[in-house]
């Protein structure tokens, strides 16, 4: 048994669980997902039994080997996969465990503005970046672009302090997960702060 192998897949994509076996006389190979049998292979008779009908068109063994290829991945395919190689020449089955993480392709992140204040000609607010469907394991980075700056800021919340009269700045939120990346529509500091300009002590959502 080798160490647990971590695999990553994307929704709609495919992943191959690699299996290299040195066992000479294989009686059967059983693939399991979260304790539920997924596929049983009996090489002698060339039999492949897919336990659930809905997985039939998703399961494949490329190049005539025993590595399992799972296609049309869904979010709930994430979990623990386990293969056991059974042979009369082995006292115990040869096993390998895998952990699969299936991620969604990210849509454009959404930006919301927090409470805004305008004191002494300086507009102060927070911009918050998030995914509308609450995708997991998303890392956010902000790009602040302008004549005077080209900065990156890690995290979903960007604190802004922009003084009227300064050159305009553009803010872009970049969202990433292991399988994709996307960016928000650009936000201009001037437009963002226009609402608070009329009342120097105003605060708004």
């Amino acid at each position: 048994s080798g160490p647990v192998k971590e695999l990553v897949g994307s929704v709609g994509g495919a992943v191959t669980f690699p299996l290299k076996s040195k066992v000479k006389q294989v009686d059967s190979i059983v693939w399991t997902f979260n304790t539920t049998p997924l596929v049983t292979i009996q090489p002698e008779g060339g039999t492949i039994i897919v336990t659930q009908n809905r997985n039939r068109e998703r399961v494949d063994f490329p190049d005539g080997g025993y590595s399992l290829k799972l296609s049309k991945l869904k979010k709930n395919d994430s979990g623990i996969y386990y293969v056991g190689i059974y042979s009369s020449s082995l006292q115990q089955p040869s096993t390998q465990e895998y952990v699969l993480h299936v991620y969604e392709h990210l849509s454009k992140p959404k930006v919301t503005m927090g409470l805004q204040s305008n004191k002494n000609g300086t507009c102060v607010t927070n911009l918050t970046c998030c995914m509308e469907h609450g995708e997991e394991d998303v890392i956010y980075t902000w790009k602040a672009l302008g004549q005077a700056a080209n900065e990156s800021h890690n995290g979903s919340i960007l604190p802004i302090s922009w003084r009227w009269g300064e050159s305009d700045m553009t803010f872009i939120c970049v969202a990433r997960n292991p399988v994709s990346r996307n960016f928000s529509s650009p936000i201009l500091a001037r437009k963002l702060c226009e609402g608070a300009a009329d009342d120097p002590d105003s605060s708004m959502v």
Epitope: V8, S10, Y103, H105, K143, P178, V179, R181, P186
Partner: antibody, heavy 119, light 107 residues
Framework: EVQLVESGGGLVQPGGSLRLSCAAS????????MSWVRQAPGKGLEWIGE????????NYTPSLKDKFIISRDNAKNSLYLQMNSLRAEDTAVYYC????????????WGQGTLVTVSS | DIQMTQSPSSLSASVGDRVTITCKAS??????VAWYQQKPGKVPKLLIY???TRHTGVPDRFSGSGSGTDFTLTISSLQPEDVATYYC?????????FGQGTKVEIK
Amino acid sequence: EVQLVESGGGLVQPGGSLRLSCAASGFDFSRYWMSWVRQAPGKGLEWIGEINPDSSTINYTPSLKDKFIISRDNAKNSLYLQMNSLRAEDTAVYYCARPDGNYWYFDVWGQGTLVTVSS
Amino acid sequence: DIQMTQSPSSLSASVGDRVTITCKASQDVGIAVAWYQQKPGKVPKLLIYWASTRHTGVPDRFSGSGSGTDFTLTISSLQPEDVATYYCQQYSSYPYTFGQGTKVEIK
């Protein structure tokens, strides 16, 4: 020094196949999305496709999806382009390119490798 | 696919001239546009990204502007070393696409 070096180009007959390699050095290759871009003689740039750090996502230009396969080996710091069913119009310099800060624009390019498809 | 149309396809200007290259996208790409310079026999070099942000080490005579569908690369004072072909690229959506290029020469 950050560097990308392509290899594997050459003369190939129409209908033939070729595998290009791109060796990366001077940066953490396993953290970056990587792209292939080509340029036909005297023509403009054409993006072929990209692969994410762990190979779980590969995006292609639709017209090239069925004949080109992008792959990588992070242990070898290498990017690959398998080209099949080559035609005369695939004659080009092939570049591998790294996006700046893992964004979408390319700040590091290889020197390119010339692929000539001719009988 | 989003088409990026550059104009002019070539131009000739004198040293010190202001040079403007335009790039028109077939649909809205926000500010997801980069500009590259490719000198004869050399590899492309990143000049501008996010439509107007200069890449590290790029001289300030190069500037980019625009959003939506219309973008401009300006060389405020053309220098002999600026002889090259310039390409715009959109990265708003797949597949990424480049303009056909603008060749800049010295009169």
